[in-house]
């Protein structure tokens, strides 16, 4: 066959769907690779063709669109499963072509099994809620296009295994789950099960997401430098190792970049000739506040090094702060000569 623009296997779109549930998968060509949509392509006389490669096979084969009850069908640029089966797992290809043009892309589809508590190998999206912030909502994701607006589905929400009906700070409101006051105890996996009728059959859509309760912007503060501080003096003799920790607390801020760095005499350590190493460690609180520690280390400090200015800097979306470490050379203890006079006297 003639040449075809092959975009290869689009592993960025690792699609996971639950077994025995409807799935609608849009051809990625129009979403990510081509500059025109399906309607334009269709009106220009281009045809969309689907085929697949089963799991652990190399053979490309056409998709069987003649299964009972139209279990697999195509509608415009969407491939429909009503419902999926476990052995639908494989790499699917959509190809757009006419006599003079051809473009195709493949993508992996994994049909996943879940247990009665909705546990599965599915990668879960994470939704962050601010702690004690007022009413916040999560919305049942990826259910658009499965049923017309005239159909009123029933939606049941679960936290882990348990139906949400006896929670005093969480209210199920259809496609939304409203958190009146988000608490650490609300951390966990939340599942919405959407049930809708279609052509005399009942279908279920299961969507699970992880809720993580994080620090509230109401409580956010600029970075706080705990160390160095005015109470600790780093007093060293030449030749000793100098270790100065810079420990900074950052409030959780959505999409904020937290930075910590040292300057020595106003310059970054990389820009000066002394043999300095910086080691960083990061820890997080339950609400994702962050503590960063950068330890500045000079193995064998010189008297010149002990005269330098060592400043710890920190920056977040809330502001920038700096604190100098108190470094000084240890004054050697004076050496006293003790003369012992021994007298031998007769008694």
């Amino acid at each position: 066959s003639e040449r075809c623009d092959d975009w290869g296997l689009d592993t960025m779109r690792q699609i996971q769907v639950f077994e025995d549930e409807p799935a609608r998968i849009k051809c990625p060509l129009f979403e990510h690779f081509l500059k025109f949509n399906y309607s334009t392509a269709h009106s220009a006389g281009l045809t969309l063709i689907w085929y697949w490669t089963r799991q652990d096979r190399d053979l490309e084969e056409p998709i069987n669109f003649r299964l009972p009850e139209n279990r697999i069908s195509k509608e415009k640029d969407v491939l429909w499963f009503r419902p999926t089966l476990l052995n639908d797992t494989g790499n699917y290809t959509c190809m757009l072509r006419n006599t003079t043009y051809c473009s195709k892309v493949a993508f992996p589809l994994e049909v996943v099994q879940k247990d009665s508590c909705f546990n599965s190998p599915m990668k879960l999206p994470v939704h962050k809620l601010y702690i004690e912030y007022g009413i916040q909502r999560i919305t049942c994701p990826n259910v658009d296009g499965y049923f017309p607006s005239s159909v009123k589905p029933t939606i049941t929400w679960y936290m882990g295994c348990y139906k949400i009906q006896n929670f005093n700070n969480v209210i199920p409101e259809g496609m939304n789950l409203s958190f009146l006051i988000a608490l650490i105890s609300n951390n966990g996996n939340y599942t919405c099960v959407v049930t809708y009728p279609e052509n005399g059959r009942t279908f279920h859509l299961t969507r699970t997401l992880t809720v993580k309760v994080v620090g509230s912007p109401k409580n956010a503060v600029p970075p706080v430098i705990h160390s160095p501080n005015d109470h600790v003096v780093y007093e060293k003799e030449p030749g000793e190792e100098l270790l100065i920790p810079c420990t900074v607390y950052f409030s959780f801020l959505m999409d904020s970049r937290n930075e910590v760095w040292w300057t020595i005499d106003g310059k970054k350590p990389d820009d000066i000739t002394i043999d300095v190493t910086i080691n960083e460690s990061i820890s997080h609180s339950r609400t994702e506040d962050e503590t960063r520690t950068q330890i500045l280390s000079i193995k064998k400090v010189t008297s010149e090094d002990l005269k330098r200015s060592y400043v710890c800097h920190a920056r977040s979306a809330k502001g920038e702060v700096a604190k100098a470490a108190k470094v000084k050379q240890k004054v050697p203890a004076p050496r006293y000569t003790v003369e012992l006079a021994c007298g031998f006297g007769a008694t």
């Epitope: 005093n168 199920p172 009146l180």
Partner: antibody, heavy 119, light 113 residues
Framework: QEQLEESGGDLVKPEGSLTLTCTAS?????????ICWVRQAPGKGLELIAC???????TWYASWAKGRFTISKTSSTTVTLQMTSLTVADTATYFC????????????WGQGTLVTVSS | ALVMTQTPSPVSAAVGGTVTINCQAS??????LAWFQQKPGQPPKLLIY???TLASGVPSRFSGSGSGTEFTLTISGVQSDDAATYYC???????????????FGGGTELVVK
């Protein structure tokens, strides 16, 4: 046995103030509960006034109650309702109830305390 | 704001009969509705929450149904002890204002003959 008891109901003059207290026994307000105040005028229906989430102190007020009524957690077993600028229309039995803002199986009511506003 | 409308009031039923009390919400409250029973001189008692879940210790002759804006409390095999006033209580949040609305219905008196 878990119980709620209201106290502080009294005869008060119009424009006067009064503080009602809801005391828990058999459980503590350190846990995550809504404690709410509800009132019922003689021969009338129930009216929710205000609620407080005991573990965090978050409050909710009925729109008509904002400004004149203040709900507070004063200890691990007491919640108060401060009422100011009282009118004859505030004459009612005042109940405190647990988990009423969002009703759960942990819902629990006190016996109520009577507030009479009269000159 | 949320308004809960109860009908009919009063309602009467014979011992052993079936009675239904309706509650209508002014907006969609999904299944966030509770039913209470109150007898004279007593505080209300929870019967049903989540529109249809029976509270513990409540006889199975009480049942709740409905979702959205229309709700029903049904008492099958009415007993003389069921003579009381019944209240519905709805709750919802407002997406545009992030307010929470909570309202009792006006109450329905059940007279048992």
């Amino acid at each position: 046995q878990e119980q709620l008891e209201e106290s502080g109901g009294d005869l008060v003059k119009p424009e006067g103030s009064l503080t009602l207290t809801c005391t828990a026994s058999g459980f503590s307000f350190s846990s995550n509960y809504w404690i709410c105040w509800v009132r019922q005028a003689p021969g009338k229906g129930l009216e929710l006034i205000a609620c407080i989430y005991t573990s965090t102190g978050n409050t909710w007020y009925a729109s008509w109650a904002k400004g004149r009524f203040t709900i507070s957690k004063t200890s691990s077993t007491t919640v108060t309702l401060q009422m100011t600028s009282l009118t004859v229309a505030d004459t009612a039995t005042y109940f405190c109830a647990r988990d009423l803002l969002v009703v759960t199986s942990f819902n629990l009511w006190g016996q109520g305390t009577l507030v009479t506003v009269s000159s | 704001a949320l308004v809960m409308t109860q009908t009919p009031s009063p309602v009467s039923a014979a011992v052993g009969g079936t009675v239904t009390i309706n509650c209508q919400a002014s907006e969609d409250i999904y299944s966030n509705l509770a039913w209470f029973q109150q007898k004279p001189g007593q505080p209300p008692k929870l019967l049903i929450y989540g529109a249809s879940t029976l509270a513990s210790g409540v006889p199975s002759r009480f049942s709740g149904s409905g979702s959205g804006t229309e709700f029903t409390l049904t008492i099958s095999g009415v007993q003389s002890d069921d003579a009381a006033t019944y209240y519905c209580l709805g709750v919802c949040t407002d997406i545009s204002t992030d307010d929470l609305y909570n309202a009792f219905g006006g109450g329905t008196e059940l007279v048992v003959k």
